[in-house]
């Protein structure tokens, strides 16, 4: 969480951003909030990116003002107009690119004053893993698959019964480049599994951490998946 205050001139207003991550090829949100102001016509929202000459986005006098927008963001940005009233200046970024990573500034002007805060935006690929029993294998085997990751993650297996056990000797992980030549499909196989145990396949890079759990008993199979973005620090 980054909290910024305005400087000089009019009063300063508090602006708050949250560091976040974007999943390439999907839409992302750059979070920014400010002290709401009743005079809507005076609210100006500017999004800037370090190293980029033009603006990322500008919202002024109740509408988007995109004459100064940088080419790399053309047609890809929007603020949520109905949320501006409650002090939400978050930016929607369509079709996130790897090159969108960097330091952004959310700069706000209201009738009460000015303020800004920076935000670190990471980009990559992350997806939920699915763990299944591999019935084609000769021994009891689990197969963990996740369709899109970047940068290349680490994969670690764990089990509820054998806590702290190292499964690297009885697992095999491969990374297969997807057709767009950036993201990769993650496949990890765990051999010699026992029934009545819960196994977890944990995939992690510097952007996200995902876990796929599977519990195999003689009568049923239970699955659960969870994905968590890392470094969501507010500013």
């Amino acid at each position: 969480l980054i909290i910024g205050f305005g400087i000089s001139g009019r009063h300063s207003i508090t602006v708050t951003t949250v560091a976040s991550a974007g999943n390439i090829g999907e839409d992302g949100i750059l979070s920014c909030t400010f002290e709401p102001d009743i005079k809507l016509s005076d609210i100006v929202i500017q999004w800037l990116k370090e190293g980029v000459i033009g603006l990322v986005h500008e919202f002024k006098e109740g509408k988007d003002e995109l004459s100064e927008q940088d080419e790399m963001f053309r047609g890809r940005t929007a603020v949520f107009a109905d949320q501006v009233i409650v002090g939400n200046a978050s930016l929607r970024l369509k079709n996130v690119q790897l090159t969108d990573a960097g330091t952004y500034k959310c700069y706000i002007i209201t009738s009460k004053g000015k303020g800004n805060a920076n935000l670190e935006y990471k980009t990559g690929a992350f997806s939920m893993p699915e763990v299944n029993v591999d019935y084609n294998a000769s021994s009891e085997t689990l197969r963990c698959e996740a369709p899109r990751w970047f940068p290349q993650p680490t994969v670690v297996w764990a089990s509820q019964v054998d806590q702290g056990a190292n499964f690297s000797e009885v697992s095999n992980t491969s990374f297969e480049l997807n057709s767009e030549n950036v993201t990769m499909k993650v496949v990890s196989v765990l051999y010699n599994v026992t029934i009545n145990n819960t196994y977890s396949c944990m995939i992690e890079n510097d952007i996200a951490k995902a876990t796929g759990d599977i519990k195999v008993t003689e009568s049923e199979i239970k699955r659960r998946s969870h994905l968590q973005l890392l470094n969501s620090k507010a500013s």
């Epitope: 002290e35 709401p36 102001d37 009743i38 005079k39 809507l40 016509s41 005076d42 006098e61 109740g62 509408k63 107009a81 109905d82 501006v84 009233i85 409650v86 002090g87």
Partner: antibody, heavy 116, light 107 residues
């Protein structure tokens, strides 16, 4: 001087619709949101919804969704609130107010009585 | 939606004394809170916004405080015109919601 002038009191039958108007100064209309807040006899304030002509947005409280329509006529700087399928519980004073997020000027209120 | 509660429901105070009214939100509203005064047969009047900023024309004896979920409105040295109903309102999220009000009465 900021003024919000509302239409007069009304008596309505259950099942009918009501429409209250709120005339504001041109500056208020072009720079601020206009919200509608009601107050049933002896009760607290209840936000129904609001419109921000400058943003082209309108928001409604879930409770009134589908039954309330808030519109704005920029040419006359007038906001309207229409509530349909009236029932006795809709008997209240209806206020228009300048804002959100908070409300710094209020209309004089319009008493709407729903009775058969 | 965010539910606003106020305490006490009514408060009897003598003129010249201090009154402290409380408002609580069911989840954090940061400082996005306003206070209103309402007298019988009249529209509400904005006293405080941003939890602690006095609206135009509001005397210094009226003050607001708090952030997150707990807020107070303090009126020092009560005068006859201060006896009314006071309610709080959050504007952190849609829908905007009001507290039920505290009736401030003359003791």
């Amino acid at each position: 001087q900021v003024q919000l002038v509302q239409s007069g009191a009304e008596v309505k039958k259950p099942g009918s619709s009501m429409r209250v108007s709120c005339k504001a100064s041109e500056d208020t209309f072009s720079s601020y949101a206009i919200s509608w807040v009601r107050q049933a006899p002896g009760q607290g304030l209840e936000w129904m919804g609001g419109t921000a002509p400058i943003f082209g947005t309108t928001n409604y409280a879930q409770k009134f969704q589908g039954r309330v329509t808030i519109t704005a006529d920029k040419s006359t700087s007038t906001a309207y609130m229409e509530l349909s399928s009236l029932r006795s519980e809709d008997t209240a004073v209806y206020y228009c107010a300048r804002g959100g997020p908070y409300f710094d000027y209020w209309g004089q209120g319009t008493l709407v009585t729903v009775s058969s | 939606e965010i539910v606003m509660t106020q305490s006490p429901a009514s408060l009897s105070v003598s003129p010249g004394e201090r009154a402290t009214l409380s408002c609580r939100a069911s989840q954090s509203v940061s400082s996005n809170l306003a206070w209103y005064q309402q007298k019988p047969g009249q529209a509400p009047r904005l006293l405080i916004y941003g939890a602690s900023t006095r609206a135009t024309g509001i005397p210094a004896r009226v003050s607001g405080g708090g952030s997150g979920t707990e807020f107070t409105l303090t009126i020092s040295s009560l005068q006859s015109e201060d006896f009314a109903v006071y309610c709080c309102q959050q504007y952190k999220n849609w829908p905007f919601t009001f507290g039920p009000g505290t009736k401030l009465e003359i003791k």
